[in-house]
């Protein structure tokens, strides 16, 4: 396994600013924890095209976070 410098965040780097809505299968939000001190937004793409990290500061990520929080609370 690779060696990680700090907590095992799922994303490395700032993430993409946006993903085409039509390509999104699912969006997952990981909140800060002992493992990772930052919020992470992970997009699962349709047609088994894998996952991408979305920049949590981007407009699209903020909209997704709001939507998920409204749904959950």
């Amino acid at each position: 396994f690779p060696m990680f410098k700090r907590g095992r965040c799922l994303c490395i780097g700032p993430g993409v600013k946006a993903v085409k809505v039509a390509d999104i299968e699912k969006a997952s939000i990981m909140y800060p924890s002992n493992n990772c001190d930052k919020i992470e937004v992970i997009i699962t793409l349709k047609e088994n095209k894998g996952q991408r990290c979305l920049n949590p500061k981007s407009k699209q990520a903020r909209l997704i976070i709001k939507k998920v929080e409204r749904k959950n609370f």
């Epitope: 410098k5 095992r8 965040c9 799922l10 780097g13 993409v16 993903v19 992970i42 991408r52």
Partner: nanobody, 126 residues
Framework: EVQLVESGGGLVQAGGSLRLSCAAS????????IGWFRQAPGKEREGVSC????????VYADSVKGRFTASSDNAKNTAYLQMNSLKPEDTAVYYC???????????????????WGQGTQVTVSS
């Protein structure tokens, strides 16, 4: 135009050190993760390290941990790979690459990256 240019390779004796540079133009390092890869003759391209220049997070391959250190200077828009305690098996062409939206689990996979440099040769003699 996006460009990555590596430099700093060369011939070094086993146990020696080299520092590779990866100068980026056409984009800012802040927006990308920078990966370092190497390819020895007849072998697959291998992920060595990855750094997020925005927060300094790093990932290293087991084969180089404790010997190689990735860093970046955002003011110079340049990433670095400090290679210490070099071994003959580190001989390869070294490439830097830039990728966006990477999961940490994908950080050492060459398919994850969008842009590549032309490579710099590192030869470690015994």
């Amino acid at each position: 135009e996006v460009q990555l240019v590596e430099s700093g390779g060369g011939l070094v004796q086993a146990g020696g050190s080299l520092r590779l540079s990866c100068a980026a133009s056409g984009f800012t390092l802040d927006d990308y993760a920078i990966g370092w890869f190497r390819q020895a003759p007849g072998k697959e391209r291998e992920g060595v390290s990855c750094i997020s220049s925005i927060d300094g997070d790093t990932v290293y391959a087991d084969s180089v941990k404790g010997r190689f250190t990735a860093s970046s200077d955002n003011a110079k828009n340049t990433a670095y790979l400090q290679m210490n305690s070099l071994k003959p098996e580190d001989t390869a062409v070294y490439y830097c690459a830039a990728g966006q939206g990477l999961l940490t689990a994908q950080a050492l996979r060459w398919e994850s990256y969008d842009y590549w440099g032309q490579g710099t040769q590192v030869t470690v003699s015994s």
